[in-house]
Interface confidence: low
């Protein structure tokens, strides 16, 4: 059988512990908040909350100012300080639950754990190309704020989403709280609500609009805020909360809950269940329900496409798509299939599905048995009746009220289960150039950043590094400042280049040089770099061939042999076809004509393995010596390919000359009827890559070959005589005379 | 092609021990979960042991709980069973099965099969 | 233990013949009921998983049917290569499985 070039794994080509190490920031505590400003004018900032501190840092990660924010009654609390004398609540830290950027103001805002969830306002001040904070201002007027009835309690000690809208002058806050019946009972904040803030910032109007978890059910049916943004005209909070209000609460799944971003109202608050399943392709799945789901989200983050992945996804290039990770449960269980995946959800047709789903609810005809849903809001009812109505009145609409879609938007993991054992706590995706990247955070403090691919069955890596060495998760919310996205891990804040740390993990010249233009690689002689890493020799231009392997090791110094090449960058063509003079193979002081390629043996070969092949015919000149030589590949003259063109030499060492000696032969006679077992003994028999034992011209069929003896079994004779023996080794003869004599059968 | 190889079987006195290997090929062996089902001469199936795919959770048949030890190997695409104290009931072909995917409903529905290994078990 | 009981425990059939495998649990089990084909000196072979469903490349002469305590494996037109032992398994109690005793298909 011909052998075969042994396969390198795609990963040969990549070291991802090469040690990167980018500008960071140690906080003092665990990062608990962090958001960027980008101003018009050059400034730009940082902000890092952590327990009872807030850090306003510069581009560079530097520190430019220090706020203190708790604990609440201590006389050091700079932001307690603004809300008038005390005391104002029970004394405690403050942990931040809520960073976010008025943009409007522009203004910081942060809301603690601490005195009743309230919020402070930070005016930004800019100063040079850095930002300072201005005194705060108290977000809570302590005349319109009762236990039942508190405009001004934002903050949920167990975790609260915002997301601020501007609508003409005003700035709405969207506000997504996780509660249970303690929080609910002490200054209620709401599970969902909209609060305009007031113009002289004295706090948040009352009156505002509402949604809340019934009490009845706030011991067991609670809800996580994971995420919330605002794209087109809508905002969107995405949730993990118990899949039924009846059922077991430990059977979770993901919601999307749409609210409109042009009318602070609640009428058309809209959710819809995300399904995100992992399909394994190791077999082809009998099963029904369309591959192991994957309920729980653990980040998203929402962003428009590039070409590639909007192609893939029948969406055009630009959209806006909602990527989410997601894991099998809490608690990770003894799970199969990967720990994360991640699955896309294209944002128009959330809202399409959202639609068909009001359509569905309100339009005749009446679909029987058809919920409205989220009874843990609001009053049970079907459709198309309003909650805890029997019947639709004549002034009221179906549309005014809210409603859970009755069918579940379900998508695929877009990595295909590569992503293994990985578990992603961390995610931000970019489009560069017509590329969409995945930045993703892992929880033993790793980044990984990922082309967002469909159709490969391996991960196109742009990097894959340690943030630092203490392993800590990385944190789930990411920001993005200018050309960096800035992660948290325990208690340092690291800026990441969104083109990658550097180029220094890929190993050869042909990964370097397929690298994605926006990373800006090239080849420095031995390594792969950026240009200010190795300004003398580095070139994005060409690749020398690399040989790593050949076959066979040895040969006749008579004959020729086929000799095949293994290694990388011999074509740049898949179908692997050799311009005329382009490839010089010379063994020891002997050429190697090049072979055309056998298209039936073409074989695909999938490209997280790769290895390239190149036979030639040896036949050693008249001067060649036996013994040990090298095995030299010049390739010369060939067309650039698509990334770079080859140029250069690869010698390997290890092939050996020797001459084959036949020295018996037995038994020297047999029946005419042929079949007898000839053993040739001798030495180097098994060199190279043919032999053929000829009885009177016919070949004995082999049965066995090595070094010092070959087995074969005589053809029929045409009569009873002696005949010519001989054993040719590369179609040249072995020297010796040899005779076989065919007898009476 | 997707594929399970048992070895380790033989002939072993009563109250010895033996060690098989089941060696899996063609699909991504750390994501499934393993078990080992048996067959004495002439009989049905009888389920012996099963393993979670990070070998954290590992379940046996009563006949031969405290007996036998199932572990694996995903680095080395490997599942194993340790049987100790064997006596002359354990005669069995010994298969290794992987499921057909990660639904409750058909976790343990086995469409892979190995060949088997005869363990005989006599004085 | 949920116990599985199998009947016939072997039966003779002639090919082109409609033969029921039927297969009872001790106690409900959903449709968490397998079937299997096994051949001498061969591995048992996947028929039907979760009662009903046909498992890839079998062909669709092959069916079941059932829910809770009682299920059925019927081959609608028995061919030469069908004649085997089937085994009903349970994985309702998994990991702690149990299979049937066995069906034999003889050729009359």
């Known amino acids: 059988e011909d052998w075969q070039c042994p396969r390198t794994p795609y990963a040969a080509s990549r070291d991802f512990d090469v040690k990167y190490v980018v500008p960071s920031f140690s906080a003092g505590g665990l990062v608990q908040a962090m958001v960027t400003y980008e101003g018009d004018r050059n400034e730009s900032a940082v902000f890092v909350a952590i327990r009872n501190r807030l850090h306003v840092l510069g581009p560079d990660l530097k520190s430019v100012q220090s706020l203190a924010t708790g604990p609440a009654g201590d006389p050091g609390c700079q932001t307690c300080a603004a809300c008038g004398p005390g005391p104002h609540g029970p004394p405690g830290d403050t942990d931040t639950k809520v960073l976010v950027l008025d943009p409007a103001l522009p203004a910081l805002v942060s809301c603690g754990s601490s005195l009743q969830g309230r919020c402070f306002l930070h005016d930004l001040e800019p100063q040079g190309t850095a930002v300072h904070l201005a005194a705060p201002a108290c977000l809570f007027s302590a005349h319109h704020n009762r236990p039942d009835d508190c405009p001004d309690c934002v903050a949920s000690p167990l975790g609260t989403r915002v997301t601020v809208v501007e609508q003409g002058q005003a700035s709405y806050f969207y506000v997504a709280s996780s509660l249970d019946a303690a929080v609910a009972a002490s200054f209620s904040p709401r599970s969902v609500s909209i609060r305009r803030l007031k113009a002289d910032a004295s706090g948040f109007a009352p009156g505002f609009v509402a949604l809340s978890v019934l009490p009845k059910h706030l011991v067991s049916y609670s809800i996580e805020y994971v995420h919330s943004f605002h794209t087109g005209a809508f905002v969107y909070f995405l949730t993990v909360q118990p899949a039924s209000v009846t059922d077991d609460p430990s059977a979770l799944h993901t919601r999307l809950a749409r609210l409109s971003a042009t009318e602070p109202e609640l009428g058309d608050y809209r959710e819809l269940v995300l399904d995100c399943r992992f399909a394994p392709k190791r077999r082809r799945r009998g099963a029904p329900e369309g591959g192991q789901p994957y309920p729980v989200l653990r980040v998203a983050h929402s962003a428009p496409v590039g070409a590639q992945l909007a192609t893939e996804l029948s969406i055009a290039e630009g959209q806006e798509v909602l990527f989410g990770v997601f894991v099998t449960g809490k608690d990770g269980g003894p799970g199969v299939g990967p720990n994360s995946v991640v699955c896309a959800f294209p944002i128009d047709l959330l809202d399409t599905l959202i639609d068909e789903g009001v359509e569905r609810c309100c339009e005749s005809p009446v679909h029987p048995g058809l919920r409205r849903g989220l009874d843990f809001f609001q009053s049970p009812s079907f459709c198309p009746n309003p909650p805890g109505l029997e019947a639709l009145s004549p002034n009221t609409s179906c549309r005014h009220f809210p409603l859970l879609v009755s069918s579940s938007f379900s998508r695929v993991d877009l990595f295909n289960g590569l992503l293994g054992p990985v578990q992603v706590t961390a995610l931000y995706v970019t489009r560069l150039d017509n590329v969409t990247v995945a930045h993703m955070g892992t929880m033993d403090g790793r980044i990984l950043q990922v082309e967002l691919v469909r159709s490969l069955n391996y991960l196109l890596y742009v990097s894959n590094f340690s943030l630092g060495d203490s392993g800590q998760p990385v944190q789930r919310d990411v920001s993005r400042l200018g050309d960096h996205l800035l992660f948290a891990s325990g208690d340092q804040v690291f800026q990441v280049p969104i083109q990658g740390p550097g180029c220094r993990h890929f190993l050869t010249c042909g990964r370097c040089l397929r690298a994605w233009h926006f990373m800006g690689c090239g080849w420095c002689g031995n390594m792969c770099g950026q240009q200010k890493e190795c300004p003398g020799s580095w070139q994005q231009d060409h690749c020398p061939p690399k040989l790593t392997e050949f076959h066979p090791h040895s040969g006749p110094l008579r004959g020729s042999t086929r000799l095949t090449l293994c290694g990388s960058n011999f074509y740049l063509h898949p179908s692997g076809l050799v311009p005329e003079g382009t490839h010089q193979v010379t063994v020891g002081q002997s050429p190697c004509r090049p072979l055309p390629k056998d298209s039936s043996k073409l074989r695909p070969v999938p490209r997280k393995d790769f290895v390239e092949e190149f036979e030639c015919e040896l036949e050693p000149l008249g001067t060649q010596a036996v013994g040990p030589t090298n095995v030299s590949l010049t390739v010369t003259n060939m067309p650039p390919g698509k990334h770079f063109r080859v140029d250069g030499t690869s010698v390997l060492r290890g092939f050996s000359f020797m001459e084959p000696v036949l020295i018996a032969v037995q038994p020297l006679f047999g029946p005419r009827a042929g079949g007898t077992c000839l053993t040739l003994e001798g030495q180097s028999l098994s060199v190279g890559t043919s032999r053929a034992v000829l009885v009177n011209g016919t070949e004995c069929l082999l049965a066995r070959v090595s070094e010092g003896q070959l087995l074969c079994a005589t053809p029929p004779g045409a009569t009873v005589a002696s005949v010519p023996l001989s054993l040719q080794v590369g179609g040249a003869q072995v020297p010796g005379s040899w005779t076989f004599q065919y007898r009476e059968d | 092609e997707v594929q399970l190889l048992e070895s380790g079987g033989g002939l072993v006195q009563p109250g010895g021990s033996l060690r098989l290997s089941c060696a899996a090929s063609?699909?991504?062996?750390?994501?499934?979960?393993m078990t080992w089902v048996r067959q004495a001469p002439g009989k049905g199936l009888e389920w012996v042991s099963y393993?979670?795919?990070?070998?954290?959770?590992?379940h046996y048949a009563d006949s031969v709980k405290g007996r036998f030890t199932i572990s694996r190997d995903n680095s080395k695409n490997t599942l194993y069973l340790q049987m100790n104290s064997l006596r002359a009931e354990d005669t069995a072909v010994y298969y290794c099965?992987?499921?057909?995917?990660?639904?409750?409903?058909?976790?343990?529905?086995?469409?892979?099969w190995g060949q088997g290994t005869m363990v005989t078990v006599s004085s | 233990d949920i116990q599985m009981t199998q009947s016939p425990s072997s039966l003779s059939a002639s090919v082109g013949d409609r033969v029921a495998i039927t297969c009872r649990a001790s106690?409900?089990?959903?449709?968490?009921l397998n079937w299997y084909q096994q051949k001498p000196g061969k591995a048992p072979k996947l028929l039907i998983y979760?009662?009903?469903k046909l498992e890839d490349g079998v062909p669709s002469r092959f069916s079941g049917s059932g829910t809770g305590t009682d299920f059925t494996l019927t081959i609608r037109s028995l061919q030469p290569e069908d004649f085997a032992s089937y085994f009903c398994?349970?994985?309702?109690?998994?990991?702690?499985?149990?299979f049937g005793p066995g069906t034999k298909v003889e050729i009359k």
């Open positions: 099965a992987s499921p057909l995917g990660f639904y409750e409903r058909v976790a343990y529905a086995f469409d892979i």
């Open positions: 063609g699909f991504t062996f750390s994501w499934y979960r």
């Open positions: 393993i979670s795919s990070s070998g954290g959770w590992t």
């Open positions: 106690q409900s089990i959903d449709t968490y």
């Open positions: 979760a009662a009903s």
């Open positions: 398994q349970q994985s309702y109690s998994s990991p702690g499985i149990t």
